[in-house]
Interface confidence: low
């Protein structure tokens, strides 16, 4: 072979990644590398990773002389150390008025009263701790419950009975029920008063109401 | 180039006290962790604890805790060690060393804390 | 706590002879993400330790490669296949897998 084929060690460099190659003999080489790299020819790059040094269940990504942690979403910072604060990041996470309450790893919510769920998005069943009398049926409402009640019941709970059932009030009287007591109340025509409509009034008067 | 430069030697009595820096150069601070391991005499290093430099989180070998706390100085790329309670056999180097491959890879030169009354 | 035990404590090998020091650790260091955190360090007096071998196998940055470590589980091995007398040291295997980090007792290599 000429001489202008001689091998020199440096040339071109054999190292890669930045490396800085230095002749070290005839045929012999050295190559200084960049931090981060390894190897004869500086080929590999080093594993930074620092297995249990990234916190909270994040997953270590190696990188050129360092290396990042890949969070869960509850965490973040370097070493997901750092708790993203849900409540900033999303305003809308807490519904119907529910309040939001940062926490470490998380968020919670404080629901208004009717409403449950992570996210007070479910409306509490309030029939499930109704006292309706039975026979009669309750109506879930938020944060409440009502009872309708079957012919002859009446009251906040259907516990009552309706005093309206005997027809009490005359001349074409409305009957209602008291839904406390119980007790009927006539709405009289026009020129009927007293507790039954039996009485006649003034053409002047009108629309008495009587409770018994 | 990596450097982690400790403060000097400490002669503590039993009962007091001792803070130990290390000035960490040639890289990210924030990027790595600081651990503190301690050497007697003789015996081998014994992993102490550890500090987060970009949020402060610490973690302590159980037998250090109640004891050991560490703090860090980001302006200035420093770490803090320090021993409260210090007993006879806490004579011992103290070294840092920084984290990478879930090993120790770069470590300060040591700092000779002797507790003797 | 995970114990580490060398073997054996000291070691004298003639200079360019092969030494061979040993660990065991008292569970498997397999660690969940799959890796085995377990880790080779060199000594010598007045100095702190220095990574040698990394993740059983990997040879940390300027490490001369007569430096070689092997093993899984619970058994590793440093091997030095040619001791030159700069190697005169205490040699400390580490492992990071379970907290707390613990070293083993230290192998001292001397030359015969």
């Known amino acids: 072979a000429g001489s202008d084929s001689l091998y020199v060690p440096c040339a071109p460099s054999p190292c890669v990644n930045g490396g800085t190659c230095r002749q070290t003999g005839d045929f012999t080489f050295e190559c200084n590398c960049l931090p981060g790299f390894e190897g004869s020819t500086c080929e590999r790059n080093i594993d930074d990773c620092p297995n249990h040094r990234c916190q909270n269940g994040g997953v270590c990504v190696d990188g050129v002389n360092t290396y990042n942690c890949r969070c869960p979403p509850q965490w973040t910072g370097q070493f997901c150390t750092e708790d993203v604060d849900e409540c900033l990041l999303q305003p809308n996470a807490c519904q119907n008025g529910g309040t939001c309450a940062n926490r470490n790893g998380g968020y919670g919510c404080v629901c208004v009263n009717g409403w449950s769920g992570d996210d007070c998005s479910e409306n509490i069943d309030d029939c499930a701790f109704a006292s309706c009398t039975p026979g009669s049926t309750c109506i879930d409402r938020v944060a409440s419950f009502s009872c309708m009640c079957p012919e002859g019941k009446a009251g906040l709970l259907c516990h009552l009975d309706d005093a309206c059932i005997s027809n009490p009030c005359h001349k074409g009287a409305l009957c209602d029920t008291n839904p406390l007591n119980g007790q009927y109340i006539c709405t009289c025509p026009q020129g009927y008063k007293g507790a039954d409509c039996t009485e006649d009034v003034d053409e002047g008067n009108s629309h008495h109401h009587h409770h018994h | 180039e990596v450097q982690l430069v400790q403060s000097g030697a400490e002669v503590k009595k039993p009962g007091a006290s001792v803070k130990v820096s290390c000035k960490a150069s040639?890289?990210?601070?924030?990027?790595?962790?600081i651990h503190w391991v301690r050497q007697a005499p003789g015996q081998g290093p014994e992993w102490t604890g550890y500090?987060?430099?970009?949020?402060?989180?610490?973690k302590f070998n159980e037998k250090f805790k109640g004891r050991a706390t560490s703090t860090v100085d980001t302006s200035i790329t420093t770490a803090y060690m320090e021993l409260s309670r210090l007993r006879s056999d806490d004579t011992v180097v103290y070294y840092c060393?920084?984290?990478?491959?879930?090993?120790?890879?770069?470590w300060g030169q040591g700092t000779l804390v002797t507790v003797s009354s | 706590d995970i114990v580490m035990t060398q073997s054996p404590d000291s070691l004298a090998v003639s200079l360019g002879e092969r030494a061979t020091i040993n660990c065991r650790s008292s569970?498997?260091?397999?660690?969940?993400?799959?890796?085995?955190?377990l880790h080779w360090y060199q000594q010598k007096p007045g100095q702190p330790p220095k990574l040698l071998i990394y993740?059983?196998?990997n040879r940390f940055s300027g490490v001369p490669d007569r430096f070689s470590g092997s093993g899984s589980g619970t058994d590793f091995t440093l091997t030095i296949s040619s001791l030159q007398a700069e190697d005169v040291a205490v040699y400390y295997c580490?492992?990071?897998?379970?907290?707390?980090?613990?070293f083993g007792g230290g192998t001292k290599v001397e030359i015969k």
């Open positions: 060393a920084r984290d990478g491959a879930g090993s120790f890879t770069y």
């Open positions: 040639g890289y990210t601070f924030s990027n790595y962790v």
């Open positions: 500090i987060i430099p970009g949020s402060g989180g610490t």
């Open positions: 569970q498997s260091l397999v660690h969940s993400d799959g890796n085995t955190y």
């Open positions: 993740r059983i196998s």
């Open positions: 580490l492992q990071s897998t379970h907290f707390p980090d613990t």
